[in-house]
């Protein structure tokens, strides 16, 4: 099966790489604009230059193109804790990230929020915090993992999943209760 091509892709595929088909004259292939520029006017004829103009401040194109307008620079989302890693240039969008000792939680493909890496108090670091993943903790004896924090087994209710991890402690408490009743 031949993959379905969009009109623009179909038109581009007629021309060699780095060129695109003139929208008004499909016998002319125009040279694409370099990154950092956009298409102001199509080339007037074969072998003639495409009129490309540099992107204005606050906009960019990251690859060769025949866009009529540059793309608007992204803004880092302060409400998500994001910080600017590198500012927007004519040929590269803003790069947003998190502060040191934070990781990204992606709500969706293009939206992330910064969260503090877990410190593994009352436990040890099993896997270090990474750009897109929180620290993985292993808890000391007498503690169980709840929402990536080591919580004392004294907070373990019998109905919770912690009962297996805290079984010796629960049995000990039960044992002392039993010994008090005899």
């Amino acid at each position: 099966l031949v993959p379905h091509l969009g009109d623009r892709e179909k038109r581009d595929s007629v021309c060699p790489q780095g060129k695109y088909i003139h929208p008004q004259n499909n016998s002319i292939c125009c040279t694409k604009c370099h990154k950092g520029t956009y298409l102001y006017n199509d080339c007037p004829g074969p072998g003639q230059d495409t009129d490309c103009r540099e992107c204005e401040s606050g906009s960019f194109t990251a690859s060769e193109n025949h866009l009529r307008h540059c793309l608007s620079c992204s803004k880092c989302r302060k409400e998500m804790g994001q910080v600017e890693i590198s500012s927007c240039t004519v040929d590269r969008d803003t790069v947003c990230g998190c502060r040191k000792n934070q990781y990204r939680h992606y709500w969706s493909e293009n939206l992330f929020q910064c969260f503090n890496c877990s410190l593994c108090l009352n436990g040890t670091v099993h896997l270090s915090c990474q750009e897109k993943q929180n620290t993985v903790c292993t808890c000391h004896a007498g503690f169980f993992l709840r929402e990536n924090e080591c919580v004392s087994c004294s907070n373990c209710k019998k109905s919770l999943e912690c009962t297996k991890l805290c079984l010796p402690q629960i049995e000990n408490v039960k044992g002392t209760e039993d010994s008090g009743t005899t």
């Epitope: 939680h105 709500w107 969706s108 493909e109 293009n110 939206l111 929020q113 969260f115 929402e147 990536n148």
Partner: nanobody, 120 residues
Amino acid sequence: EVQLLESGGGLVQPGGSLRLSCAASGFTFTRYSMGWVRQAPGKGLEWVSMIDVGGRHTYYADSVKGRFTISRDNSKNTLYLQMNSLRAEDTAVYYCAKISQFGPNAFDYWGQGTLVTVSS
């Protein structure tokens, strides 16, 4: 068919509390982050809060931090928003929303909304 049905809105005095609920159906609730969005009269949409599948990650708009609490009950396919210390500026239609995993938009499905009016 994805369905999100909000309830719990109403008229409340400033300083009062309300708890909104959202019953979800038509998709695997436990696979998706969920959120609440609101639209005040004559204003645009504002993200209020979001929660991930396990409830470990939450987001709150600065305007509601410390007053609102988002939670979910995966066994009941229900999302909640506990709203305390309500203010007049919290008056809005509140929408429950399913968060999209892909694409440019954070939310891909919305409920019909429930109206919250804060007035003395």
